[in-house]
Interface confidence: medium
């Protein structure tokens, strides 16, 4: 049975806390850190940073599970991205989606001027 | 003085409601409508759909303001995307950002299995 993605994400958050000391052992490394809180726009950079981190981290043990979970999350996001243009529907349904997107932007995004 | 983006978004939502009848006058048109609610992953498709809609809509009058505002929103999002990889920081700061992203994913994303 496939584990729900929400469970994978929660588990990953726990593992991230547990492995912080190991992951931050290389203090010379520099990774891309976005300068705003709209994380959803920066998924490419987040996973690019994770690839760098993965290649610089001593592997083995339970940290493997963390990277496996992060890989599952990336696959999930890629699948979701594929679904963006999967269906072509009527204008009114497109407008519903646009309206929802702008509603989310209006309430949940961190916006400056 | 630059209008805050939050104001532009709210104004666009109002304009969208006001112009719905005009925008849906071509019932044969088909536009990309994502099959999930993680709008943030589908920004490319949303604006691609808007370009199609713009080219098919009778122009002039107050609907111009709607398309101008949508263009401002696109520019804002593009600027935000540029800021994703602008800075390189230490691992712990990258991990903070990753943690925030996963936290948002865990609480705000619509996730299936």
């Amino acid at each position: 049975m496939e584990i729900p993605m929400s469970t994978v994400v929660k588990e990953t958050l726990t593992q991230l806390s547990a492995h912080r000391a190991l992951l931050t052992s290389n203090e010379t490394m520099r990774l891309p850190v976005p300068t705003h809180k709209n994380h959803q726009l920066c998924i490419g950079e987040i996973f690019q940073g994770l690839d760098i981190l993965k290649n610089q981290t001593v592997r083995g043990g339970t940290v493997e599970m963390l990277f496996q979970n992060l890989s599952l999350i990336k696959k999930y996001i890629d699948r979701q991205k594929e679904k963006c243009g999967e269906e072509r529907r009527r204008t009114r349904q497109f407008l519903d989606y646009l309206q929802e997107f702008l509603g989310v932007m209006s309430t949940e995004w961190a916006m400056e001027g | 003085m630059e209008i805050p983006m939050s104001t532009v978004v709210k104004e666009t939502l109002t304009q969208l409601s006001a112009h719905r009848a005009l925008l849906t006058s071509n019932e044969t048109m088909r536009l990309p409508v994502p099959t999930h609610k993680n709008h943030q992953l589908c920004i490319g498709e949303i604006f691609q759909g808007l370009d199609i809609l713009k080219n098919q809509t009778v122009r002039g009058g107050t609907v111009e303001m709607l398309f101008q505002n949508l263009s401002l929103i696109k520019k804002y999002i593009d600027r935000q995307k540029e800021k994703c990889g602008e800075e390189r920081r230490r691992t712990r700061q990258f991990l903070d950002y990753l943690q925030e992203f996963l936290g948002v994913m865990s609480t705000e994303w619509a996730m299936e299995g």
Partner: antibody
Amino acid sequence: QVQLVQSGAEVKKPGASVKVSCKASGYTFTNHHINWVRQAPGQGLEWIGYINPYNDYSRYNQKFKGRATLTVDKSTSTAYMELSSLRSEDTAVYYCARDYGNFWYFDVWGQGTLVTVSS
Amino acid sequence: DIQMTQSPSSLSASVGDRVTITCKASQDINSYLSWIQQKPGKAPKTLIHRADRLIDGVPSRFSGSGSGQDFTLTISSLQPEDFATYYCLQYDDFPYTFGQGTKVEIK
């Protein structure tokens, strides 16, 4: 407040036509589609079609195509539904309903107009 | 045309009961479904749209769920004013089609 007020009851002979009106008030008439729905006595609801008052574009249920005609008069904010070649099975209450601007559900309904077709 | 099959066609319940009505579409309608209440001799009234969104002013005892083909309307605690006929309506594709209705009667 937003209201749709329909014309009064009609009695028609088979083969005749009927024109039901639906006067809108309390909102910008051209911003919302007007749908027409009917309900035969003791039966369920049936969608006839809608009209977009902005450009007079109308869409019909195939079942009524050719017999139903949807029109609007923007100057009086009134929508009309005309049904021709009436038969006894067209006896029903006819409702107009406004499409809400965001998300397309019917948010306001007229009070209904009873059309009786009888010889 | 998309067929909407509602069940049950009628039910008897008491004040305070939890009532569930289901609606099945003959094909995927996404979440383009609304629930409509009609009392005898009155115009219909929309309660829920987009499958689960309660319309302003509608009591919170009404709730909707589902997507795709299977949908449910739930009244958590039936009140005297809830005795009526309930219809589902799909507005995903033309022609819009209604379920045949569920009459909720007093036991």
